[in-house]
Every structure is written in C-alpha cells, then in structure tokens.
C-alpha cells in the first residue's frame, strides 16, 4: 500500500530561539577569537617591522627584548615574516568567513522572528517589549573641557568616521560636521559633544516645520533641515553604527518645560533586516535588566508604504503617522504628527509624537532629539 508519510514535527519557538542564539553566540565567539588572533599578529608584525634594520645588524634601536649586542639572522627573520604573512592571510580569510556567517545568522534570526509573529506564536507581552523601562537621566552630560583639536588632527588625514572619532581627536564643540563612515559617501551630521564623547544626532523635532509622514525611501535616505528638524536617514545611521552595538539616547521635552533623557544599548540592522532595532545589554552602570526586552527581540522599521510592524491586523505607520520601529503601535512614535495644541478627537491625537511610559499615550510631545554613539568594536552583537 501507499507509504504513510509522517506529518512533519515543527520545532517549537523555544527550540528555534535556543538554536538561533546558540548559533549567534558561536559566530560571535569565532569572530572574537579571529579578532584577538589578528590583533596579536599585527602587534607582532608591528614589533618586527619596528625592529627593522636593527635586527639585521645596522644601527637603530629596537623595542624587542634583545641583548644590546645580539643580532638576528636575516634568514630567520625573513622566514618568520613569511610565516606571519601566511598566518595573517589565513586569519583574514577566517575573519571574513565568520563575518559572512554572522550576517547570514542574523538574517535567519530575523526570519525566525517574522515567521513567529506571522503565526501568532509570540506571547503578547513579548510584543510590548518596548515598555521595558530604560535608565533615566535628565540631561546628556555637559560639554567636556575644551581640548585643542589642532594637537591631534594630524592623526586624521581623512574625514572622520563619526562624531566619536571627532571627539577622540580633540573636537569639543557641538555643531555640523562632515563625516564619512567606511564604505559610505561623505555626509553632514550634527554632532553633540559631551563628557561621554561624541554623539550623532539622528532625529530632531521642535516646531513642526518638517513633514515626517513620508515613505520608506525618504526614511532610508533622510530628510529635513540639518539646522532645524530632520531625520538623518536609516542608511546613514547604519553606515555609522555598522555591526557594532550602539548607545541610543532619546531626549524628550513636554510643553511645561520638563525634560527626560532615556538611554538604551541597541543594535541596528541593515536594510536586509528592515533596519531592525534590537535592544541589547543595559548600558553599564544603569538600571540593569529592566532595560532589556525578553529574548532581545528585534523590531523592524515601518512606514506607510512598507509595513514591517509586528501587528498582523494593522499597518501602524498608516493608522498613526510617520515611520518608526513599531511593535504594537501603542508604545512610542517620535516621528508622528506635530501638534502645537492637543486635538479634541482621540483618533487624531493618537497620530502625534508620544512616548507612552513618560507622558502617556495621548500626550503630544513638544520636542524630541535622538542621538547615537557606536560602542567599541568588541561590543558588537
């Protein structure tokens, strides 16, 4: 008779999650190992080239621990350098493989999350992960003591990668700068210099002069006036953060002059992930695990013409206004419609700029600023 086909057993969400996280950690471990080995090798290589002529018997000092009279056989040195080069290129290959694998895994991870939300497997409290209270401070730290950038600028014979790099070469004045992240054309950014370093302003609202109800391509490229209200652009933000984790600071102001500063540790994906924003570990020294959503869930960016939100029954961007990382449509939207006074109709009011856990779902905020600062490369997710 006909062969009885077994109905397939689908992996449970927990199993998928464990598998995905395991794979991500494995990729991360491999990448960290490759990075460590690579930096050890380049350090060794630097020491060998610094050693240079001294090791070959001509004059000049060396920082290698050689006895004053000792000399290294040039052949031995040459063979060492050849081995180093070969080792280095093997490490380079491994590094690229790991990075490739990492990207692939991140895509898989996102697909799993999408599938999950489509099949309604998600517990609804997971969807409202945005409600997790971030650490709060009233202001970004004040501007640090001025340092003369002229002392350090000779270190930078190209455009800076981001505001943090500008800060590192001594710039302490906030304002408009030209930057050029790796693999990106140059563009203009507002840098906010604080005692915590250089932050890139990615969004600013304060007077309603710019329409934020725009399509996907506008949110991708950026729009507005760098001197006034603007959205920097998802692609530009992603070019700044790359694969690194970043600190995201959100400054909110209400109509009574009260201000709030929220800080998160985040990871922003590329366009292939719909610029998904993932809340990662809490920022050091802040309120701890309350900052982290369950499972480190990623939320894709949505606009009225590209609906990636986690609601099956609704297009959040269309029913509200503007583009945002919409989870359930109800927690926050800093790119909503600007209201100078509170509209009477609740239906209209819900389209406004709001942050539910601060002033409430139906309070249109007066001003918002979003700033990002990539963390050191080793903090990458």
């Amino acid at each position: 008779g006909p062969v009885q086909s077994k109905s397939p057993r689908f992996a449970s969400w927990d199993e998928m999650n464990v598998l995905a996280h395991g794979l991500l950690q494995l990729g991360q471990g491999l990448r960290e190992h490759a990075e460590r080995t690579r930096s050890q090798l380049s350090a060794l290589e630097r020491r060998l080239s610094a050693c240079g002529s001294a090791c070959q018997g001509t004059e000049g000092s060396t920082d290698l621990p050689l006895a004053p009279e000792s000399r290294v056989d040039p052949e031995v040195l040459h063979s060492l350098q050849t081995q180093l080069k070969a080792q280095n290129s093997r490490i380079q290959q491994l590094f690229h493989k790991v990075a490739q694998q990492q990207r692939h895994l991140e895509k898989q991870h996102l697909r799993i999350q999408h599938l999950q939300s489509q099949f309604g497997l998600l517990d609804h409290k997971h969807l409202d992960h945005e409600v997790a209270k971030p650490a709060r401070r009233k202001r970004l730290p004040e501007m640090a003591q001025p340092v003369d950038p002229a002392h350090n600028v000779s270190r930078l014979h190209r455009l800076p990668r981001d505001c943090q790099e500008l800060f590192q070469v001594g710039e302490r004045q906030s304002g408009l700068f030209e930057i050029q992240p790796q693999g990106s054309p140059p563009f203009l950014v507002n840098c906010k210099m604080t005692s915590d370093g250089g932050w890139t302003v990615i969004q600013r609202r304060h007077d309603g002069s710019v329409d934020f109800n725009r399509p996907w391509e506008a949110y991708k490229a950026g729009f507005g006036d760098p001197h006034g209200e603007f959205w920097l652009g998802l692609e530009k933000v992603h070019s700044i953060t790359g694969d690194r984790n970043s600190r995201l600071a959100v400054q909110l102001r209400d109509w009574d002059g009260n201000a709030e500063l929220l800080q998160f540790s985040v990871h922003l994906g590329g366009e292939d992930t719909a610029y998904s924003l993932q809340l990662t570990a809490p920022v050091a020294g802040q309120l701890g695990a309350t900052t982290v959503p369950p499972s480190g869930l990623s939320v894709p960016f949505s606009t009225w013409d590209q609906d990636h939100d986690l609601r099956r029954d609704k297009n959040c961007a269309k029913s509200l206004s503007g583009g945002w990382w919409f989870g359930t449509c109800s927690h926050s939207n800093l790119n909503g419609q600007y209201f100078r006074s509170i509209p009477q109709q609740r239906q209209k009011l819900k389209k406004g700029i709001f942050w539910k856990t601060w002033r409430g779902r139906y309070y249109p905020l007066q001003a918002t600023t979003m700033l990002i600062q990539p963390m050191a490369a080793e903090a990458a997710s």
């Epitope: 950038p149 002229a150 600028v153 000779s154 930078l156 014979h157 455009l159 800076p160 500008l166 070469v169 001594g170 710039e171 004045q173 304002g175 408009l176 700068f177 030209e178 930057i179 050029q180 054309p185 140059p186 563009f187 203009l188 001197h227």
Partner: antibody
Amino acid sequence: EVQLVESGGGLVKPGGSLRLSCAASGFTFSSYSMNWVRQAPGKGLEWVSSISSSSTYIYYADSVKGRFTISRDNAKNSLYLQMNSLRAEDTAVYYCARDGAIFGVVNWYFDLWGRGT
Amino acid sequence: EIVLTQSPDFQSVTPKEKVTITCRASQSIGSSLHWYQQKPDQSPKLLIKYASQSFSGVPSRFSGSGSGTDFTLTINSLEAEDAATYYCHQSSNLPHTFGPGTKVDIK
C-alpha cells in the same frame, strides 16, 4: 608657522575675470572647511563663500552666486576663488579664512585669517 | 538673512577704562555669535567664540556674554593696543553675517 597667504588680486574691467588663490601652511589643510570673506574699502566684513574639507559642501552669498566658484586642492594645500562677470561692487580686499572646527561645516567661527589680496 | 546691529558705532575711551559693545540679532541665534578685532591695515582676529568662550591667546580683559538676540563684548581696563574696530559675526544661519563694526579709539 600656521598661516594663510592670498594672491591673485588685481585691477580688472567690469565683466572681467580673476582667480584668487590662498596657500595654507603649518596645519592639516585637508581637515578644515575654508572660506572667502571680503571687505570693501572703508566698509565692514562680508562673507562670500565656504567649501567643506572634502569639497562636498559648497555655499555662496546671494550677491556672488552664479558668478564666483570656490574650489580647493588638498594635495597642494590651496584654496581658490574663480571670479567671473566682475562688477564694481566686487571691489574689496578678499580674505581667506579657516573654519574653527576640524571637519566642521557651515556653522563655525573663523579662527585663522590671511592678510588679504 | 539675519541682520546684526552694533552699538555704538564709535567709542573714544581713555586707557584703563571699561568698554562695552553690544550686538543685536534680528532673530534668535542661540549662542552662535563670535567677536573679532581688526586693527588698521590688518586682517581680523578672533577674540570670542560662541558668545562667551575666549579664544586661545586672547588677553583675559576681553570677555563676552549673551544669548538669543542680545550680546555684549566687554573690554575691562582698556589698553592702548586695543584701538581697533570690533565686529560681531553670526554663524547660526546661512549666509554668515557680520555687524557693521564698532570703532574704538584711545583718547
């Protein structure tokens, strides 16, 4: 020594052209936006044009738009101002001035000035 | 464009006296206001940036204050070498604009 030296000024008939140059030395020229500011005889200062470190961002005063062109050559540490369709009201001392922030664009003070041409 | 007006146009002062020059902007410019000193037949020199920050190497008798639309440059205890024209400059909006200048001479 950190300095800016302008050259290329001269007498020209209305409708004529002139090219001003500014040679920079003593600092990393390619890291700064640069500007031209002019001063008519016995008058105040007037900003003319700005160019960002990579030449990506260029701005002009309305009074010179379409007639003047700012450019730079980072390899030669030089800034230029090509002035066409000159008018009597363009008569002035032209100063080359450096933006006060490395890689700054537009909203900065001028911390180093040439002697003018 | 943002128009800057300075007052007075001219001031004749005796050494050691205190000099106050004001600059008013036609609209709010935050603290994006800078002061320059220009001596006869010389190029301008930066004195104060961002309304109140002294530029390196500038004598401490020069100070600046203000924000929004009203700004002040103060020279405490004027010296003979301070005879010059003083200009304010806004960089908040393009085009950059300068005030008409205040000429300070020594009695």
